[in-house]
């Protein structure tokens, strides 16, 4: 009864196609697969950024896999060959691991890389990123931003930099077609005649950094003697109504402050006949149904009612 053995995959490597963190892991079939002609071997691939506690695990019949990584750190990966149950009478047969690593040799000291990188996708339309120069870098230092997402043939450089004192401190992006709900990769590198500059890599998804416009057309409607309905409209732009959460601040007679978070463009407020003045403001944010995170809009213009008209049916301003 001969022991079944299988070799690890050959030529296991991590290839960087220049997509700022989206890497290819590829390998060749193991030697001596002839004994297993009736079996479809599978490969168990494990990979992670160095320093991460957990491995990502994939099982595939293919000879390649692609995923995104943080190029600020190194990458380690390992792979072995698995034989399916049908070929092994139920016992596990797997090869030894083939292992590989990848990292970008860092230039410059960490302090030279950009500081406080901040990116906002305004109203799900306009992406703007800003940063501060590295610590202790000279004025001759300039930073360049490159970006890539799936759908672009290659990484692109920013063409509309925001400048301060002749230095690039931000980027206004062009229209980014079909760029949400996928990883968006950025590299900010730099050059200086004085000393090498450390590159920085960032990855995010655009729908998670949206800052909407504030709601518009705030109105009051008297529903009953003790209820007033506050209404507003979604801001102009591409964000559908189903994607919004709202926060309202209501001030009654300069004293009572009510805050509430709602999912619709209305809020019903209990009032008394003694109420002489009512003001409210609203702000919006993309909700959990459309993103994992978001940024609150600015507050809307304040809408107020003053005087006797609160007993009337509709109050518009």
């Amino acid at each position: 009864d001969t022991e079944i053995k299988v070799n690890p995959p050959q030529d296991f490597e991590i290839v960087d196609p220049g997509y700022l963190g989206y890497l290819y892991l590829q390998w060749q079939p193991p030697l001596s697969l002839d004994h297993f002609k009736e079996c479809t071997v599978e490969y168990e691939l494990k990979y992670r950024n160095i320093g991460s506690e957990t491995w990502k695990t994939i099982i595939t019949k293919n000879l390649h896999y692609k995923d995104g990584f943080d190029l600020n750190k190194g990458i380690e990966a390992k792979i072995h060959t698995l034989l399916p149950w049908q070929c092994t009478n139920g016992s596990e047969v797997q090869s030894s691991w083939a292992e590989t690593t990848y990292w970008i040799s860092p230039q410059g000291i960490p302090e030279t890389k950009v500081q406080d990188m901040d990116c906002v996708y305004y109203n799900w339309q306009y992406l703007l990123c800003s940063w501060k120069p590295g610590i202790g870098v000279l004025l001759d230092t300039n930073y360049n931003l490159f970006y890539w997402y799936e759908g672009l043939d290659h990484a692109l450089q920013c063409v509309d930099y925001i400048k301060a004192d002749g230095q690039n401190i931000g980027c206004r992006f062009p229209y980014l077609e079909a760029s949400d709900y996928k990883d968006f990769y950025i590299c900010v590198n730099g050059s200086s005649e004085n000393k090498p500059i450390r590159s920085s890599y960032f990855t995010f998804q655009l729908q998670n950094i949206v800052k909407p416009l504030p709601p518009v057309y705030l109105t009051f409607t008297r529903e009953s003697s003790c209820e007033i309905k506050l209404k507003w409209s979604i801001p102009l732009g591409p964000i559908p109504a189903r994607c919004f959460d709202y926060e309202i601040e209501i001030r009654e007679d300069d004293t009572t402050l009510v805050t509430a978070t709602v999912e619709n463009e209305t809020y019903t407020l209990k009032t008394t006949n003694e109420t002489r003045q009512l003001c409210f403001v609203v702000r919006s944010k993309v909700n959990i149904y459309c993103s994992d995170d978001g940024i609150w809009s600015e507050w809307s213009d304040k809408q107020c009612w003053e005087g006797e008209d609160l007993s009337k049916k509709t109050l518009l301003r």
Epitope: E42, I59, L82, C87, G90, S91, E92, Q94
Partner: nanobody
């Protein structure tokens, strides 16, 4: 006949819950590690959670704190309790026997999470 059979998939709103089951038959279930994998748009199956024959569990970072794997060696069944589901959890979910047993796949069960 050696077999793994998943059940419990379905459609759910984002934020909802589902519990998947995988019944094993035809082999000594208790000695095998078991895993839940999923396949979305890609051909590859990614490990979601696994449980060794001694009950040790590991989870992919994307599901930590939301999914729980468990096993019942009397019923020869492994479970995946999925809470706070997200649209990106939409996939076909497969259970698989793991080491020290050979690799054996179930047929899969579809999970669809809509916003």
């Amino acid at each position: 006949q050696v077999k793994l059979e998943e059940s419990g998939g379905g459609s759910v709103q984002a934020g909802g819950s589902l519990k998947l089951s995988c019944a094993a038959s035809g082999y000594n279930f208790s000695k095998c590690g078991m895993g839940w994998f999923r396949r979305a748009l890609r051909e590859e199956r990614e490990l979601v959670a696994e449980i060794s024959n001694d009950g040790t569990t590991t989870y992919d970072d994307s599901v930590k704190g939301r999914f729980t794997i468990s096993r019942d060696n009397v019923k020869n069944t492994v479970y995946l309790q999925m809470n706070n589901l997200k649209t990106e959890d939409t996939a076909v979910y497969y259970c698989a026997s793991r080491n020290p047993c050979g690799l054996l796949w179930g047929q899969g069960t579809q999970v669809t999470v809509s916003s």
